[in-house]
Interface confidence: low
Amino acid sequence: MGNSCYNIVATLLLVLNFERTRSLQDPCSNCPAGTFCDNNRNQICSPCPPNSFSSAGGQRTCDICRQCKGVFRTRKECSSTSNAECDCTPGFHCLGAGCSMCEQDCKQGQELTKKGCKDCCFGTFNDQKRGICRPWTNCSLDGKSVLVNGTKERDVVCGPSPADLSPGASSVTPPAPAREPGHSPQIISFFLALTSTALLFLLFFLTLRFSVVKRGRKKLLYIFKQPFMRPVQTTQEEDGCSCRFPEEEEGGCEL
């Protein structure tokens, strides 16, 4: 009984002594953020010198504050407990973690290339002051037609597919209401549109057949080829637009 009581007291004393020696051995653990444990001054907690900070307690040195220089400007001043934060001066925007770089802005309809800001090539657009020119949406991939042509600054606007458009019908189809049982007006108008399209095609082929007899086979081939020829764009090319070739790096900032 007395022996076990002695063991408990001894253990308690050991634990208490260990805690005391630990804090004696490492007084630095008591130094709060904004200070450092100064070895030159008997390990007392000294405040961080100007232009430095410590964001956590128990640090043996303070870190130098980031300096927002050049095209960087100070977004948040450095304090004794937190680093400075930078952003970019007007005309530049941040890149990288913590705004580690500033990149030049361009106008909408342009992208930054190795030779500075260049206009987007025909068939591409950029609606921001940063980033690269992106290709216009290919409406036909979704079975739609181009409603509004694209520009250097704006993407194309896709409308309903040509089959959805009957002569004299509205060019923008409103969203379809919930379907009801029976023949809804939508279904009737759809069949009417389909019939009128079939009639148009029939007329078209009859006219073609007549033109073959009249003008010969060469003309027919020309009519078929023509709609699929790519439009040749000249004015922007001469302006020096930023046409990108497959081997060129995309999006990278040229220093």
Partner: antibody, heavy 122, light 106 residues
Framework: EVQLVESGGGLVQPGGSLRLSCAAS?????????WGWIRQAPGKGLEWVSG????????YYADSVKGRFTISRDNSKNTLYLQLNSLRAEDTAVYYC??????????????WGQGTLVTVSS | DIQLTQSPSSLSASVGDRVTITCRAS??????LGWYQQKPGKAPKLLIY???SLQSGVPSRFSGSGSGTDFTLTISSLQPEDFATYYC????????FGQGTKVEIK
């Protein structure tokens, strides 16, 4: 093509002064670039000395030259300068002027001059 | 000031070798680190900026990696024209360079 040509180096006695010039061609130094002077003592590594912000409103100096060297620029002459005063033997080095890239203010130098040698000796 | 320590200070290698040079910062510098190559009597040439971005016109055998305090420059297959001295440089707080690593022919 951007070209930077330094001049003004030479032999000078301790305590003496020199003015280094860096003439830029093929590029306007007022176009928002950051510019810097970097030196290299014979057989030693590179040491950044001084810098001037793209808009000329902020200047930077290494502790070793603070109060003795002054960086400036003359946009009309398209030239960057470094005024060296109270020269010491340890300032002996090849001095390069260099340009910070246009699309970044991160302090990397993409164009360098060929350097001008400054020798401080009695 | 922020100190940069390069290792090794010099190394011998053969053409075709893979070479790795490290640069350690005395405190975290995010990705604000560049690498330069310098040949005797010439001005330094920028190879890598922002820790890992390859400067225009620099061969793709050069690559950079790292963030915070530890950075690496790798030459995947050493070419005869790559024998030179390489410097790292931080731009987090003003600018400082490492002491350099000389790459010599074995």
């Amino acid at each position: 093509e951007v070209q930077l040509v330094e001049s003004g180096g030479g032999l000078v006695q301790p305590g003496g002064s020199l003015r280094l010039s860096c003439a830029a061609s093929g590029y306007s130094i007022s176009s928002g670039h950051h510019w810097g002077w970097i030196r290299q003592a014979p057989g030693k590594g590179l040491e950044w000395v001084s810098g001037i912000s793209g808009y000329g409103d902020t200047t930077y100096y290494a502790d070793s030259v603070k109060g003795r060297f002054t960086i400036s620029r003359d946009n009309s002459k398209n030239t960057l300068y470094l005024q060296l005063n109270s020269l010491r033997a340890e300032d002996t080095a090849v001095y390069y002027c260099a340009r910070d890239p246009y699309s970044s203010g991160s302090g990397y130098f993409d164009y360098w001059g060929q350097g001008t040698l400054v020798t401080v000796s009695s | 000031d922020i100190q940069l320590t390069q290792s090794p200070s010099s190394l011998s290698a053969s053409v075709g070798d893979r070479v790795t040079i490290t640069c350690r910062a005395s405190q975290g510098i995010s990705s604000a680190l560049g690498w330069y190559q310098q040949k005797p009597g010439k001005a330094p040439k920028l190879l890598i900026y922002a820790a890992s971005s390859l400067q225009s016109g620099v061969p793709s055998r050069f690559s950079g990696s790292g963030s915070g305090t530890d950075f690496t420059l790798t030459i995947s297959s050493l070419q005869p024209e790559d024998f030179a001295t390489y410097y790292c440089q931080q731009s987090y707080y003003t600018w400082t360079f490492g002491q350099g690593t000389k790459v010599e022919i074995k």
